[in-house]
């Protein structure tokens, strides 16, 4: 029961996280014009991974895409790559984890297969989250470096008469969305890995021997006691009847209300 809950919660948390990573990647506000200690302008600049935008006080907003690959800073390309890798891994992880969910039955898929798929998706979510966090952190570091560089020579004057105010950029909303989303995906991945441990069957390698007692048609497997893993609801020993591999959790062929988070 707790395994199902952990797995389901891990899936939901990762789903939210990956949606956040996608949102952050698409957002235009990765860096925004620093308004602190600057003359008040009628124009507000902000930049994303794919385009830069200018919002005028009149409400008019103009965005221009970066229609070049070679002309862009290597760091920006690296951030783009990290975010895309994070999205791709996360999407694959989601796909895998859907089939790995304990509450969803696909044919006669064994617990061991589901456990492996859960672990795979968990690892994918962890890597996806790390990619997003790394991407956002690299961009944030780039911003901090540029911020202090532009602060150092903020005013470049001609004989002290004419001043050019350099536009300084600070952290945009997308960075915080990215950090939170990456963290959620990471947490979701860890939960999936934990759920995997609870799903994995730890049976002994004894051969199943059938004892036919008179008047009973029940096949009893001596190796039918599952060792407790300490995870989830599988803390009490459970006998496996009918020669099948189903535990008491799985006797119902329809999902119970407890199978949903």
């Amino acid at each position: 029961m707790a395994v199902t809950a952990c797995q389901g919660l891990g899936f939901v948390v990762s789903l939210i996280g990956i949606a956040g990573i996608i949102a952050a990647t698409c957002m235009d506000q990765w860096s925004t014009q620093d308004l602190y200690n600057n003359p008040v302008t009628a124009v507000f600049n902000y930049q994303g991974l794919w385009r830069s935008c200018v919002r005028e006080s009149s409400g008019f907003t103009e965005c221009r895409g970066y229609f070049t690959l070679l002309g862009l800073p290597a760091m920006l390309q690296a951030v783009r790559a990290l975010m895309i890798v994070g999205i791709v891994l996360g999407a694959i992880g989601l796909l895998v984890s859907i089939f790995a969910l304990k509450c969803i039955r696909i044919g006669s898929m064994e617990d061991s297969a589901k456990a492996n798929m859960t672990l795979t998706s968990g690892i994918m979510f962890i890597v996806s989250g790390l990619c997003a966090i790394a991407g956002v952190s690299v961009f944030a570091n780039m911003l901090v470096t540029n911020f202090w560089m532009s602060t150092a020579n903020m005013y470049t004057g001609m004989g002290g008469m004419v001043q050019t105010v350099q536009t300084r950029y600070t952290f945009g909303a997308a960075l915080f969305v990215g950090w939170v989303a990456g963290g959620l995906t990471l947490i979701g991945g860890v939960m999936m890995c934990i759920a995997c441990r609870g799903l994995a069957p730890e049976e002994t390698n004894y051969k199943a021997v059938s004892y036919h007692a008179s008047g009973h048609s029940v096949a009893y497997k001596p190796g039918g006691f599952k060792a407790s893993t300490g995870f989830g609801s599988n803390t009490k020993n459970k006998k496996i009847y009918d020669g099948g591999a189903r535990t008491e959790d799985e006797v119902q062929s329809y999902p119970s209300k407890h199978d949903y988070v």
Epitope: P39, T41, A42, V54, E56, S58, E62, R64, V165
Partner: antibody
């Protein structure tokens, strides 16, 4: 067509208040910013204030606190509340519409004269 | 506040000749985000409200004759009347549309020589 008509000007004593109105037609105040600009007799143009489409306002530093710009979207009317008037506030007051992109005043009213005199 | 300085204060040009008015701002009016200059030029004839001629430093407002042109970037801007006509006699103002408050230049009076 776009039209701006100012009203409310006149002779007022120093220290008194006056409210100017600007009736806008041919466009909506929810879509465009509108400015007040003044011109003292025989002098150049002086930017006074602006109220943007969203309702945000900006003022000339020297007038902040004494002058208040506002608008009534339903009446399509812009206002300039002028308090503690001084002799140097004597001018023709124009209201002008912002063009939207690249921030310039594309339509102007004919102006209303405010004379501050004792 | 941003100081807008126009030169000359007055200008006398023969009909059909070129008239050039300069405007200098105390800070750059070029926005790095879109590489646009936030400067406008206005024409004011006696007893009339100002009329927008040029915005964005170089874009002519619709209905404005093509003899009027704007140029410059950053802090230095120019309004050029390529062939002065009698109806161009007026006072011309440049305006900062970038920094609040939006300040005007002191104006340049154009007359016929």
């Amino acid at each position: 067509q776009v039209q701006l008509v100012e009203s409310g000007g006149g002779v007022v004593q120093p220290g008194r208040s006056l409210r100017l109105s600007c009736a806008a037609s041919g466009f909506t105040l929810t879509s465009y910013g509108v400015y007040w600009v003044r011109q003292a007799p025989g002098k150049g143009l002086e930017w006074v204030a602006v109220v943007w489409a969203g309702g945000n306002t900006n003022y000339a530093d020297a007038l902040k606190g004494r002058f208040t710009i506002s608008k009534d979207n339903s009446k399509s009317t812009l206002y300039l509340q002028m308090n503690s008037l001084r002799a140097e506030d004597t001018a023709v007051y124009y209201c002008a519409r912002d063009r939207g992109r690249l921030l310039a005043m594309d339509y102007w009213g004919q102006g209303t004269l405010v004379t501050v005199s004792s | 506040d941003i100081v807008m300085t126009q030169s000359p204060d007055s200008l006398a040009v023969s009909l059909g000749e070129r008239a050039t008015i300069n405007c200098k701002s105390s800070q750059s009016l070029l926005n790095s985000g879109n590489q646009k200059n936030y400067l406008a030029w206005y024409q004011q004839k006696p007893g009339q409200p100002p009329k927008l001629l040029i915005y964005g430093a170089s874009t002519r407002e619709s209905g404005v004759p093509d003899r009027f042109s704007g140029s410059g970037s950053g802090t230095d801007f120019t309004l050029t009347i390529s062939s002065l006509q009698a109806e161009d006699v007026a006072v011309y103002y440049c305006q900062n549309d970038y920094f609040f408050p939006f300040t005007f230049g002191q104006g340049t009076k154009v007359e016929i020589k």
